[in-house]
């Protein structure tokens, strides 16, 4: 029913710049939050959770022009080599006592592109 769309398989980024990771969701159902992670499995790193936590380098991006989906994209500022990896937007279904992972996007691999040229 719900689709998680991450259109870019690969995103080349530059150290010091801002990276935009796109994710659109076709339905709010099942009810529950969308979180961003880097990597998969139990060792994955939480990148953004709007409801709780402090993520000073992350801001949300909202494209309101699309009638048929919702935008859950994020921007990560001040990129460093430590930020490379594959990023996933993940839909959770509200549950008790804990939310349950429902569906993940296919992932976007963030890799370093060419270094900025000297002025």
């Amino acid at each position: 029913e719900l689709q998680m769309i991450q259109p870019e398989k690969l995103l080349l980024v530059t150290v010091g710049k801002t990276a935009t990771l796109h994710c659109t969701v076709t339905s709010l159902l099942p009810v529950g939050p969308v979180l961003w992670f880097r990597g998969v499995g139990p060792g994955r790193e939480l990148i953004y959770n709007q409801k709780e936590g402090h993520f000073p380098r992350v801001t949300t991006v909202s494209d309101l022009t699309k009638r048929n989906n919702m935008d859950f994209s994020i921007r990560i500022s001040s990129i460093t080599p430590a930020d490379v990896g594959t990023y996933y937007c993940v839909k959770f279904r509200k549950g008790s006592p804990e939310n349950v992972e429902f569906k993940s996007g296919p992932g976007t691999e963030m890799a370093l592109g060419a270094k900025p040229s000297a002025p």
Partner: antibody
Amino acid sequence: EVQLVESGGGLVKPGGSLRLSCAASGFTFSSYVMSWVRQTPGKGLEWVATISSGGTYTYYPDSVKGRFTLSRDNAKNSLYLQMNSLRAEDTAVYYCASQLTGSEFDYWGQGTTVTVSS
Amino acid sequence: DIVLTQSPASLAVSLGERATISCRASESVDLYGTSFMHWYQQKPGQPPKLLIYRASNLESGVPDRFSGSGSRTDFTLTINPLQAEDVATYYCHQSSDELPWTFGGGTKVEIK
């Protein structure tokens, strides 16, 4: 042209049951989240139930949970609301409404009136 | 539950003037920068009709004299200029990921 046509309303005694139906046409019913919203003069608009496009997930407010059951038949482009243990406070106009994204209510039917009274 | 408080409850505005309706939510209805607040128009004997979705987006076919603004907890519906056919009751509605979804109490707009 999008059409949502409700039926099944009527007069019922407290504790009784009713089954509301909503026939949909003019859009891809199986792609839409569907809901019922009711309206009373005293309480205004109140969300009553929602079902996901494939019918897997249903949601209800506490006021009807355990008494109302929402289902759908995508092959028949139809939505159903089974209402049991009806109370006087369930008296309202019941609207069937579509939600492409499970967010805003895009289209509404004309409504069917449910009266619960002894 | 997220409570939506609309004000005023009723509003009388001269034809051609601006009508402004406020909707305040008891907590934020924003998700990832999108405000899940919507506005509907209801005329007597008719079902509600979607005017504005996600705070500021004009639904297809709705005249551009209707506009919406706001974020987080404070939202506004503006009709400018008001036309005779705009006499109706207007409702705000939030559909954040916190159930239950709720509606405001409505604002009745009349001609002065």
